[in-house]
Protein backbone atom coordinates (compact mmCIF):
# COMPACT_ATOMS: atom_id res chain seq x y z
CA UNK A 1 0.00 0.00 0.00
CA UNK A 2 1.42 3.42 -0.92
CA UNK A 3 2.23 5.75 1.93
CA UNK A 4 3.11 9.43 2.28
CA UNK A 5 5.41 10.66 5.02
CA UNK A 6 5.70 14.24 6.27
CA UNK A 7 8.42 15.76 8.45
CA UNK A 8 8.56 19.34 9.70
CA UNK A 9 12.01 20.53 10.69
CA UNK A 10 13.05 23.61 12.60
CA UNK A 11 16.60 24.75 11.96
CA UNK A 12 18.80 24.69 15.05
CA UNK A 13 20.50 27.94 14.11
CA UNK A 14 17.35 29.87 13.23
CA UNK A 15 14.28 29.16 15.35
CA UNK A 16 12.07 30.92 12.83
CA UNK A 17 13.33 28.88 9.87
CA UNK A 18 11.29 25.80 8.96
CA UNK A 19 11.47 23.16 6.26
CA UNK A 20 8.78 20.66 5.34
CA UNK A 21 9.97 17.34 3.90
CA UNK A 22 7.56 14.93 2.22
CA UNK A 23 7.99 11.62 0.49
CA UNK A 24 6.02 8.97 -1.32
CA UNK A 25 6.56 5.30 -0.56
CA UNK A 26 5.01 3.28 -3.34
CA UNK A 27 5.60 1.74 -6.74
CA UNK A 28 3.82 4.31 -8.93
CA UNK A 29 5.25 7.26 -10.79
CA UNK A 30 4.52 10.66 -9.27
CA UNK A 31 2.68 13.13 -11.49
CA UNK A 32 2.22 16.04 -9.07
CA UNK A 33 2.88 17.04 -5.46
CA UNK A 34 0.81 19.64 -3.64
CA UNK A 35 1.88 21.07 -0.28
CA UNK A 36 -0.65 22.95 1.83
CA UNK A 37 -0.93 24.26 5.35
CA UNK A 38 -3.80 24.50 7.80
CA UNK A 39 -5.29 21.26 6.51
CA UNK A 40 -5.48 19.05 3.43
CA UNK A 41 -5.61 20.64 -0.02
CA UNK A 42 -9.21 21.43 -0.91
CA UNK A 43 -10.42 20.76 2.64
CA UNK A 44 -9.68 24.04 4.36
CA UNK A 45 -5.97 24.02 3.64
CA UNK A 46 -4.13 26.79 1.83
CA UNK A 47 -1.89 25.77 -1.05
CA UNK A 48 1.79 26.57 -0.52
CA UNK A 49 3.42 24.84 -3.47
CA UNK A 50 2.84 22.58 -6.44
CA UNK A 51 5.71 20.53 -7.85
CA UNK A 52 5.69 18.72 -11.18
CA UNK A 53 8.42 16.14 -11.83
CA UNK A 54 9.13 17.55 -15.30
CA UNK A 55 7.67 21.04 -15.46
CA UNK A 56 8.90 22.64 -12.26
CA UNK A 57 7.36 24.50 -9.34
CA UNK A 58 4.74 27.06 -8.40
CA UNK A 59 4.76 28.40 -4.86
CA UNK A 60 3.10 31.02 -2.67
CA UNK A 61 4.10 32.84 0.49
CA UNK A 62 5.31 31.90 3.01
CA UNK A 63 6.99 29.29 0.80
CA UNK A 64 10.57 30.32 0.02
CA UNK A 65 11.91 27.42 -2.03
CA UNK A 66 10.21 24.22 -3.14
CA UNK A 67 12.45 21.53 -4.62
CA UNK A 68 12.66 17.90 -5.49
CA UNK A 69 15.10 16.06 -3.23
CA UNK A 70 14.76 12.68 -4.91
CA UNK A 71 12.39 11.23 -7.50
CA UNK A 72 9.90 10.53 -4.72
CA UNK A 73 10.52 13.24 -2.13
CA UNK A 74 10.38 17.04 -1.95
CA UNK A 75 11.33 19.79 0.46
CA UNK A 76 9.72 23.15 1.08
CA UNK A 77 11.65 25.88 2.89
CA UNK A 78 9.45 28.48 4.53
CA UNK A 79 10.06 32.21 4.83
CA UNK A 80 11.63 33.55 7.97
CA UNK A 81 8.79 35.64 9.37
CA UNK A 82 10.88 37.20 12.09
CA UNK A 83 8.72 35.63 14.79
CA UNK A 84 10.05 32.86 17.01
CA UNK A 85 8.70 29.46 15.90
CA UNK A 86 5.98 30.98 13.70
CA UNK A 87 4.88 27.60 12.30
CA UNK A 88 5.19 25.59 15.52
CA UNK A 89 1.51 24.70 15.76
CA UNK A 90 0.76 24.58 12.07
CA UNK A 91 -0.27 21.46 10.19
CA UNK A 92 1.39 20.85 6.83
CA UNK A 93 -0.05 18.41 4.32
CA UNK A 94 1.49 16.81 1.26
CA UNK A 95 -0.58 15.23 -1.49
CA UNK A 96 1.13 12.98 -4.02
CA UNK A 97 -0.75 12.25 -7.21
CA UNK A 98 0.65 9.09 -8.72
CA UNK A 99 -0.16 6.68 -11.49
CA UNK A 100 -1.84 4.25 -11.17
CA UNK A 101 -2.46 4.51 -7.42
CA UNK A 102 -4.38 7.80 -7.33
CA UNK A 103 -3.80 10.55 -4.76
CA UNK A 104 -2.35 9.99 -1.33
CA UNK A 105 -2.08 12.68 1.31
CA UNK A 106 -0.58 12.92 4.77
CA UNK A 107 -0.23 15.72 7.27
CA UNK A 108 2.31 16.51 9.94
CA UNK A 109 3.44 19.26 12.26
CA UNK A 110 6.26 20.12 14.59
CA UNK A 111 5.41 18.90 18.11
CA UNK A 112 5.46 21.75 20.69
CA UNK A 113 8.15 19.90 22.65
CA UNK A 114 10.48 19.45 19.67
CA UNK A 115 14.07 20.51 20.13
CA UNK A 116 15.47 22.82 17.45
CA UNK A 117 17.05 20.88 14.66
CA UNK A 118 15.00 17.77 15.26
CA UNK A 119 12.34 16.53 12.90
CA UNK A 120 8.82 15.68 13.84
CA UNK A 121 8.28 11.95 13.50
CA UNK A 122 6.46 10.93 10.32
CA UNK A 123 2.72 11.11 10.91
CA UNK A 124 1.12 9.52 7.89
CA UNK A 125 -2.63 9.95 7.66
CA UNK A 126 -3.26 8.49 4.23
CA UNK A 127 -6.27 9.74 2.35
CA UNK A 128 -6.96 7.71 -0.76
CA UNK A 129 -8.48 9.73 -3.55
CA UNK A 130 -9.33 8.35 -6.94
CA UNK A 131 -8.08 10.51 -9.79
Amino acid sequence: TPEVWVQVQMEATELSSFTVHCGFLGPGSISLVTVSWGGPDGAGGTKLAVLHPELGTRQWAPARQARWETQSSISLALEDSGASSPFANTTFCCKFASFPEGSWESCGSLPPSSDPGLSAPPTPVPILRAD
Partner: antibody, heavy 119, light 107 residues
Protein backbone atom coordinates in the same frame (compact mmCIF):
# COMPACT_ATOMS: atom_id res chain seq x y z
CA UNK B 1 -10.42 36.83 -27.04
CA UNK B 2 -8.20 36.70 -23.97
CA UNK B 3 -6.57 40.08 -23.31
CA UNK B 4 -4.45 41.70 -20.63
CA UNK B 5 -4.68 45.46 -20.98
CA UNK B 6 -2.13 47.39 -18.97
CA UNK B 7 -2.22 51.01 -17.84
CA UNK B 8 -0.42 53.75 -19.74
CA UNK B 9 3.15 55.05 -19.44
CA UNK B 10 4.29 56.67 -16.21
CA UNK B 11 6.85 59.40 -15.67
CA UNK B 12 7.69 59.55 -11.98
CA UNK B 13 10.20 61.19 -9.70
CA UNK B 14 12.95 59.35 -7.78
CA UNK B 15 11.83 58.26 -4.34
CA UNK B 16 8.17 58.15 -5.27
CA UNK B 17 5.85 55.21 -5.88
CA UNK B 18 3.79 54.08 -8.84
CA UNK B 19 0.92 51.62 -9.18
CA UNK B 20 0.34 50.01 -12.55
CA UNK B 21 -2.62 47.88 -13.55
CA UNK B 22 -3.38 44.84 -15.67
CA UNK B 23 -7.04 44.39 -16.63
CA UNK B 24 -8.01 40.90 -17.75
CA UNK B 25 -10.82 40.07 -20.14
CA UNK B 26 -12.05 37.11 -22.15
CA UNK B 27 -11.66 34.49 -19.42
CA UNK B 28 -12.54 33.74 -15.80
CA UNK B 29 -10.15 35.97 -13.91
CA UNK B 30 -9.84 33.80 -10.80
CA UNK B 31 -8.92 30.67 -12.75
CA UNK B 32 -5.40 31.80 -13.64
CA UNK B 33 -2.41 33.21 -11.78
CA UNK B 34 -0.94 36.47 -13.06
CA UNK B 35 2.81 37.04 -12.97
CA UNK B 36 4.80 40.22 -13.52
CA UNK B 37 8.02 40.71 -15.46
CA UNK B 38 10.49 43.58 -15.83
CA UNK B 39 12.33 44.40 -19.04
CA UNK B 40 14.95 47.10 -18.74
CA UNK B 41 15.96 48.95 -21.88
CA UNK B 42 18.09 46.80 -24.13
CA UNK B 43 18.19 43.90 -21.70
CA UNK B 44 16.44 40.66 -20.90
CA UNK B 45 13.38 39.87 -18.84
CA UNK B 46 13.24 39.38 -15.09
CA UNK B 47 10.48 37.59 -13.20
CA UNK B 48 9.17 39.79 -10.38
CA UNK B 49 6.47 37.68 -8.81
CA UNK B 50 3.11 35.97 -9.05
CA UNK B 51 -0.38 36.59 -7.76
CA UNK B 52 -3.31 34.20 -7.37
CA UNK B 53 -6.46 36.27 -7.99
CA UNK B 54 -8.52 33.52 -6.40
CA UNK B 55 -7.20 34.02 -2.86
CA UNK B 56 -4.70 36.87 -3.11
CA UNK B 57 -1.71 34.61 -2.46
CA UNK B 58 1.59 35.97 -3.72
CA UNK B 59 5.11 34.86 -4.46
CA UNK B 60 8.06 37.17 -5.04
CA UNK B 61 11.51 37.03 -6.49
CA UNK B 62 13.70 37.88 -3.48
CA UNK B 63 15.33 40.60 -5.58
CA UNK B 64 12.03 42.49 -5.76
CA UNK B 65 10.85 41.99 -2.19
CA UNK B 66 10.30 45.39 -0.67
CA UNK B 67 10.29 46.94 -4.14
CA UNK B 68 7.12 45.44 -5.64
CA UNK B 69 3.75 44.70 -4.06
CA UNK B 70 1.15 42.69 -5.96
CA UNK B 71 -2.55 43.09 -5.28
CA UNK B 72 -5.79 42.25 -7.02
CA UNK B 73 -9.35 43.54 -7.37
CA UNK B 74 -11.55 40.62 -8.30
CA UNK B 75 -14.59 42.80 -8.89
CA UNK B 76 -12.90 44.55 -11.81
CA UNK B 77 -10.74 41.60 -12.92
CA UNK B 78 -7.67 43.77 -12.43
CA UNK B 79 -4.25 42.99 -11.00
CA UNK B 80 -1.97 45.72 -9.69
CA UNK B 81 1.72 46.10 -9.05
CA UNK B 82 3.00 48.92 -6.88
CA UNK B 83 6.67 49.88 -7.11
CA UNK B 84 8.09 52.02 -4.33
CA UNK B 85 11.23 54.02 -3.51
CA UNK B 86 11.82 54.39 -7.23
CA UNK B 87 15.27 54.98 -8.69
CA UNK B 88 16.57 55.17 -12.24
CA UNK B 89 17.22 51.40 -12.01
CA UNK B 90 13.45 50.89 -11.95
CA UNK B 91 12.98 52.55 -15.34
CA UNK B 92 11.74 49.71 -17.53
CA UNK B 93 8.79 48.16 -19.31
CA UNK B 94 6.70 46.02 -16.97
CA UNK B 95 4.53 43.16 -18.24
CA UNK B 96 1.83 41.08 -16.65
CA UNK B 97 1.35 37.58 -18.03
CA UNK B 98 -1.20 34.83 -17.50
CA UNK B 99 0.11 31.52 -16.19
CA UNK B 100 -1.53 28.44 -17.70
CA UNK B 101 -1.38 25.98 -14.80
CA UNK B 102 -2.42 23.05 -16.96
CA UNK B 103 0.43 23.41 -19.44
CA UNK B 104 2.80 25.38 -17.21
CA UNK B 105 3.70 28.46 -19.25
CA UNK B 106 2.81 32.11 -19.83
CA UNK B 107 0.24 31.79 -22.58
CA UNK B 108 -0.90 35.44 -22.75
CA UNK B 109 1.10 38.60 -22.09
CA UNK B 110 -0.06 42.09 -21.26
CA UNK B 111 0.45 45.14 -23.43
CA UNK B 112 3.26 46.42 -21.21
CA UNK B 113 3.64 49.59 -19.14
CA UNK B 114 6.64 51.86 -19.51
CA UNK B 115 7.84 53.41 -16.25
CA UNK B 116 10.39 56.21 -16.49
CA UNK B 117 12.01 57.47 -13.30
CA UNK B 118 13.49 60.91 -13.76
CA UNK B 119 13.83 64.13 -11.83
CA UNK C 1 19.43 31.15 -8.98
CA UNK C 2 19.44 29.12 -12.17
CA UNK C 3 21.26 30.94 -14.97
CA UNK C 4 19.91 30.53 -18.48
CA UNK C 5 22.62 31.30 -21.04
CA UNK C 6 21.85 32.21 -24.63
CA UNK C 7 25.39 32.46 -25.90
CA UNK C 8 24.53 34.13 -29.19
CA UNK C 9 23.13 37.62 -28.76
CA UNK C 10 22.63 38.04 -32.50
CA UNK C 11 22.10 35.58 -35.32
CA UNK C 12 21.94 36.46 -38.99
CA UNK C 13 20.05 34.31 -41.46
CA UNK C 14 18.33 34.49 -44.83
CA UNK C 15 14.72 33.87 -45.78
CA UNK C 16 14.26 30.15 -46.39
CA UNK C 17 17.19 29.13 -44.22
CA UNK C 18 17.16 27.03 -41.08
CA UNK C 19 18.41 28.53 -37.83
CA UNK C 20 18.95 27.05 -34.35
CA UNK C 21 18.93 29.19 -31.20
CA UNK C 22 20.38 27.58 -28.10
CA UNK C 23 19.84 28.01 -24.38
CA UNK C 24 21.86 26.35 -21.61
CA UNK C 25 20.71 26.02 -18.00
CA UNK C 26 23.23 26.16 -15.15
CA UNK C 27 21.61 23.10 -13.59
CA UNK C 28 19.19 20.39 -14.66
CA UNK C 29 15.71 21.77 -15.27
CA UNK C 30 14.14 18.69 -16.88
CA UNK C 31 11.71 20.06 -19.50
CA UNK C 32 10.66 23.15 -17.53
CA UNK C 33 11.69 25.50 -20.32
CA UNK C 34 9.65 27.72 -22.62
CA UNK C 35 10.51 29.94 -25.58
CA UNK C 36 9.04 33.39 -26.16
CA UNK C 37 9.22 35.63 -29.22
CA UNK C 38 9.34 39.41 -28.96
CA UNK C 39 9.10 41.60 -32.00
CA UNK C 40 10.35 45.18 -31.84
CA UNK C 41 8.03 47.41 -29.83
CA UNK C 42 5.73 44.53 -28.92
CA UNK C 43 5.05 42.31 -25.92
CA UNK C 44 6.55 38.83 -25.76
CA UNK C 45 4.45 36.00 -27.17
CA UNK C 46 4.49 32.31 -26.31
CA UNK C 47 6.09 30.04 -28.89
CA UNK C 48 7.10 26.77 -27.22
CA UNK C 49 6.33 25.33 -23.79
CA UNK C 50 7.50 22.22 -21.94
CA UNK C 51 10.65 22.40 -24.11
CA UNK C 52 8.95 21.04 -27.22
CA UNK C 53 5.22 21.77 -27.39
CA UNK C 54 4.05 24.51 -29.75
CA UNK C 55 1.71 27.16 -28.42
CA UNK C 56 -1.65 27.38 -30.20
CA UNK C 57 -1.35 28.95 -33.62
CA UNK C 58 2.44 28.82 -33.82
CA UNK C 59 3.59 27.65 -37.29
CA UNK C 60 5.12 24.19 -37.39
CA UNK C 61 8.36 25.61 -38.74
CA UNK C 62 9.12 26.42 -35.08
CA UNK C 63 10.43 23.41 -33.16
CA UNK C 64 11.68 23.13 -29.60
CA UNK C 65 13.92 20.36 -28.35
CA UNK C 66 16.11 19.39 -25.42
CA UNK C 67 15.86 18.42 -21.78
CA UNK C 68 18.09 18.62 -18.73
CA UNK C 69 20.40 21.55 -19.38
CA UNK C 70 20.54 22.04 -23.17
CA UNK C 71 17.66 23.44 -25.18
CA UNK C 72 17.24 24.47 -28.80
CA UNK C 73 14.68 26.47 -30.72
CA UNK C 74 14.87 25.65 -34.42
CA UNK C 75 13.19 27.72 -37.12
CA UNK C 76 12.91 25.98 -40.47
CA UNK C 77 12.28 27.95 -43.65
CA UNK C 78 12.82 31.30 -41.93
CA UNK C 79 10.36 34.01 -42.94
CA UNK C 80 10.80 37.78 -42.81
CA UNK C 81 8.17 37.99 -40.07
CA UNK C 82 10.44 35.89 -37.82
CA UNK C 83 12.65 38.95 -37.33
CA UNK C 84 12.47 39.18 -33.52
CA UNK C 85 14.23 38.48 -30.26
CA UNK C 86 13.84 35.03 -28.73
CA UNK C 87 13.99 34.31 -25.01
CA UNK C 88 14.12 31.05 -23.11
CA UNK C 89 12.64 30.77 -19.61
CA UNK C 90 13.07 28.16 -16.88
CA UNK C 91 10.38 27.52 -14.28
CA UNK C 92 11.99 24.54 -12.58
CA UNK C 93 13.00 26.51 -9.48
CA UNK C 94 12.26 29.92 -8.03
CA UNK C 95 12.98 32.53 -9.01
CA UNK C 96 12.05 31.87 -12.62
CA UNK C 97 14.83 33.12 -14.88
CA UNK C 98 15.07 34.12 -18.54
CA UNK C 99 17.93 33.79 -20.96
CA UNK C 100 19.54 36.99 -22.19
CA UNK C 101 17.79 36.78 -25.55
CA UNK C 102 18.91 36.11 -29.12
CA UNK C 103 18.07 38.65 -31.82
CA UNK C 104 17.38 37.12 -35.19
CA UNK C 105 18.40 39.33 -38.11
CA UNK C 106 17.26 38.68 -41.66
CA UNK C 107 19.90 39.31 -44.34
Amino acid sequence: EVQLQQSGPELVKPGSSVKISCKASGYTFTDYNLDWMKQSHGSSLEWIGAMSPNNGATSYNQKFKGKATLTVDKSSSTAYMELRSLTSEDSAVYYCARWDSNSWYFDVWGTGTTVTVSS
Amino acid sequence: DIVMTQSQKFMSTSVGDRVSITCKASQIVRTAVDWYQQKSGQSPKALIYSASTRHTGVPDRFTGSGSGTDFTLTIDNVQSEDLAEYFCLQHWNYPYTFGGGTKLEIK
